[in-house]
């Protein structure tokens, strides 16, 4: 079929077009162009014989139209008016006609763009701007750009006028942008320049900085005001209400108590006639006095006097503060504030009630602090010590023992033998002692102050003979291989020889093992569950010697990983399952048992009869000892067989 | 579900013996230790000793050392506590308990008690 | 042998309260401490073990804490059918020693 393509369909003006012909049939005698959608021979363009290859133009002919042997039409240097159908009727040799229509439209080519406002300088919150794409153009479409971006969706953004006009209603400062439209048809497109929007908004609510309202006496007063604003404000200061300067600093050096009062920034837009303020009110204090503390008892007793500090001097409306060792107050039942807080009270004082205390009046920029105060506390004597440790001694040495007595003031001492009063001295002194000097030895220490006494007795045995020692030890149950164990000998004696035995053994060497104390104290360290023996000590001077009583060490180990026997995994159908698990451990563990995850009994022996392959999984043994917080566990996986089904199959228990 | 199950009251004269039993049920007999607590009129809880039903060992507290007796027969899944020289003072419930496991386990289903009443 | 001393020996409190009594060794136990509570005319049921376990079908009101020698049992808030003796036991070899117990009572 005979079929006419427009190339292109869409034509600029000025450009050309060929109307290309399709399917031209055979045996052709000539063929005709024709403006319109039919054979109109007021209208035609062009005809053409091929038998002469002559063309002859027709009353539509513009001399713009060139014909190929092929039918084509070339038409060039488009105009508006070409704009509508062309037709091609072609006659066949035979006579026979065939006709075809194809059509092209003609497009200006756009000019470039360009914005024209109804406003040039909107007010915030006030006015609407309109934006028109200029010129009108006839089927051209109109498109707008924001920040090189498409329109947002705004209901205060509409398009109008077949979108040639852009209106933002009800304009915001965040509409400052950049604005662009394009005009676009077929055959072009055109952008604008860009057109800046100025909004014109504020002053928003000044702010004065710095935030600070406090002030000492003295400092310099540096206020800054800043308001947002297009066009930027004016700043105007005002102090209690009085004009001051129109600066946005304000600055008064060396301010006084008098320069108390509302400091008053005020911003104006001389473009949108708005004016706002903000008020700070500032406070200038004077320095405050510094602080000192009294105290109602300068020299209280331990346990039974009460002190009352009191911060000076008494302020109104002033926060008071205290502080214990440069530390805020604990908190203490024996620790009260008055109601202000000027007054501390210490109820029932002790010795480690000294302080030093510090009292601070706090105003709103800083915290004076008193000097410290010590409380002289008045204690003791605790239970006098009597050194040296020895109460066996051998005939023919000194005896010389010291008393001491924690004490405030220090505290006097006094020396009984058997109830007889000796001396008021501290260390008590006799030569050359026999068996007669053995008995009850009394230091009695006395404070004056409190009027307080305490006394402490030691038994001194003089004698050839050395008692039957006996072993401390200041750790009975120490954990494997993280506690030390320290055994002492007693009693501490004179000019004597210390000696251990393990299992009845002299020591062994090892690193673990140390000797101390003149070989009175056997240490070990890092103990082990080997370490676990009889430890027996034993004492000897030049005339005798003795052994004490043996001491086991109960060593807290484990629990080792424990071990499931028997060793069997695979079982019959039918069987019994007893599985046993063990783990060394002191004391002994806790046990539990897991099959496939679950809990099931806290037993040593699981047992399971008449088991099937359901039994099948893992068998997980947990063991706990709480002694030593350790735990350890072992998995095993069983594997239970239809009867007869493998060889090698356990029978169970 | 366990259960122990107490023989009943008893009362006997002052240097007599008296036998309680107590018998298990609902789980393996011989993987749980059993102990023996008794309870004076009025009084707390005191321990008196236990017995492992699979090794029949047997652990009394000092205060009943000499006293005490305790069995198990595994056939039957029940154990006997046996006191004898009873006082007036031996008077209490006596309950058998389950040990929640082996070893270091607190006592986790108590039979129902049983009365022993020593009086001449 | 292990004391275990039991503080207080009563006490008396409303329904809603919490309720603390405390059980002290006269040596260190670890954890092996246990809780029972017995109701007038029943026997001692088992309610925590290894000091914190609470066992499966107590009441989550129930709660132990401690170790060494020092040992709490708490109920949260205090209900009428809690209404019992409370015996603490230490469970760290034998012999087995209990609490005198606590007597807890509704106001």
């Known amino acids: 079929k005979l079929t006419i393509e427009s190339t292109p369909f869409n034509v600029a003006e000025g450009k050309e077009v060929l109307l290309l012909v399709h399917n031209l049939p055979q045996h052709l005698f000539g063929y005709s162009w024709y403006k319109g959608e039919r054979v109109d021979g007021n209208r035609q363009i062009i005809g053409y014989v091929i038998g002469t290859q002559q063309a002859t133009p027709g009353p539509a002919y513009s001399g713009r139209e060139i014909i190929y042997p092929n039918a084509s039409l070339l038409i060039q240097n488009i105009i508006q008016n070409d704009t509508g159908f062309y037709t091609l009727h072609v006659i066949k040799s035979d006579l026979v006609n065939e006709e075809a229509t194809g059509q092209f439209r003609v497009y200006p080519e756009l000019p470039k763009p360009s914005i024209s406002s109804n406003n040039s300088k909107p007010v915030e919150d006030k006015d609407a701007v309109a934006f028109t794409c200029e010129p009108e153009t006839q089927d051209a479409t109109y498109l707008w750009w924001v920040n090189n971006q498409s329109l947002p969706v705004s209901p205060r953004l509409q398009l109008s006028n077949g979108n040639r006009t852009l209106t933002l209603f009800n304009v915001t400062r965040n509409d400052t942008a950049s604005y662009k439209c394009e005009t676009q048809n077929p055959v072009s497109a055109r952008r604008s320049d860009s057109v800046i929007l100025n909004v014109l908004y504020g002053p928003d609510a000044p702010t004065i900085s710095p935030l600070n309202t406090s002030y000492r006496s003295g400092e310099n007063l540096n206020l800054s005001c800043h308001a947002a604003s297009n066009p930027p404000a004016q700043y105007s200061w005002f102090v209690n209400g009085t004009f001051q300067q129109s600066t946005q600093e304000l600055f008064i050096p060396n301010i006084t108590v008098n320069n108390s009062g509302s400091y008053t920034c005020q911003a104006h837009n001389s473009d949108t006639g708005l004016n706002r303020t903000t008020v700070t009110t500032i406070t200038v204090y004077a320095e405050p006095p510094k602080p000192f503390i009294t105290s109602n008892n300068s020299n209280p007793v331990e346990d039974e006097d009460a002190v009352a500090l009191t911060c000076e001097p008494e302020i109104q409306n002033t926060t008071y503060l205290w502080w214990v060792n440069n530390q805020s107050l604990p908190v203490s039942p024996r620790l009260q504030l008055s109601n202000d807080n000027r007054t501390l009270t210490l109820l029932s004082v002790t010795r480690n009630d000294v302080g030093p205390y510090e009292c601070g009046i706090q105003n709103e920029l800083s915290v004076d602090h008193s000097d410290p105060v010590i409380l002289n506390v008045l204690y003791g004597p605790d239970d006098p010590t009597i050194s040296p440790s020895y109460t066996y001694y051998r005939p023919g040495v000194n005896l010389s023992l010291s008393c001491h007595a924690a004490s405030n003031p220090p505290a006097q001492y006094s020396w009984l033998i058997d109830g007889n009063i000796q001396q008021h001295t501290q260390e008590l002194f006799i030569s050359n002692i026999t068996e007669k000097n053995s008995g009850l030895y009394t230091c009695q220490a006395n404070n004056s102050a409190s009027g307080h006494s305490r006394t402490t007795v030691k038994t001194i045995t003089v004698s050839a003979e050395l008692p039957k020692p006996s072993i401390s030890s200041n750790n009975s149950k120490p954990v494997e291989d993280k506690d030390a164990v320290a055994f002492t000998c007693e009693p501490e004696a004179q000019n004597t020889t210390y000696l251990w035995w393990v299992n009845g053994q002299s020591l062994p060497v090892s690193p673990r093992l140390q000797l101390s104390n003149g070989n009175r104290t056997l240490t070990l360290f890092n103990v082990t569950r080997n370490d676990a023996r009889a430890y027996v000590c034993g004492i000897q001077n030049s005339v005798s010697a003795n052994r004490s009583d043996p001491v086991t060490l109960d060593v807290l180990y484990g629990p080792d990983t424990p071990i499931i026997s028997p060793p069997d995994s695979s079982y019959l159908s039918g069987a019994n399952l007893n599985l046993s698990c063990h783990s060394a451990s002191n004391p002994s563990p806790q046990y539990s048992w897991r099959i496939n995850g679950i809990p099931q009994q806290h037993t040593q022996v699981l047992f399971i009869a008449k088991i099937t392959p359901n039994n099948n999984g893992t068998y997980a043994c947990f063991v706990s000892n709480l002694a030593t917080g350790r735990n350890n566990s072992i998995v095993k996986s069983i594997t239970v067989s239809a009867s007869g089904t493998s060889p090698g199959l356990s029978a169970g228990a | 579900q366990v259960q122990l199950v107490q023989s009943g009251a008893e009362v006997k004269k002052p240097g007599a013996s008296v036998k309680v039993s107590c018998k298990a049920s609902?789980?393996?007999?011989?993987?749980?230790?059993l102990h023996w607590v008794r309870q004076a009129p009025g009084q707390g809880l005191e321990w008196i000793g236990y017995i492992n039903p699979n090794t029949g060992y047997t652990n009394y507290s000092q205060k009943f050392q000499g006293r005490v007796t305790m069995t198990r027969d595994t056939s039957t899944s029940t154990v006997y506590m046996e006191l004898s020289s009873l006082r007036s003072e031996d008077t209490a419930v006596y309950y058998c308990a389950r040990e929640y496991g082996n070893y270091n386990y607190p006592l986790d289903y108590w039979g129902q008690g049983t009365l022993v009443t020593v009086s001449s | 042998d292990i004391q275990m001393t039991q503080s207080p020996s009563s006490l008396s409190a409303s329904v809603g309260d919490r309720v603390t009594i405390t059980c002290r060794a006269s040596?260190?136990?670890?954890?092996?401490l246990a809780w029972y509570q017995q109701k007038p005319g029943k026997v001692p049921k088992l309610l925590i073990y290894?000091?914190?376990n609470l066992v499966e079908g107590v009441p989550s009101r129930f709660s132990g804490s401690g170790s060494g020698t020092d040992f709490t049992l708490t109920i949260s808030s205090l209900q009428p059918e809690d209404v019992a003796t409370y015996y603490c036991q230490h469970h760290y070899g034998t012999p087995y020693t209990f609490g005198q117990g606590t007597k807890v009572e509704i106001k």
């Open positions: 040596e260190n136990i670890y954890g092996y």
């Open positions: 609902g789980y393996i007999f011989t993987s749980y230790w």
């Open positions: 290894n000091a914190k």
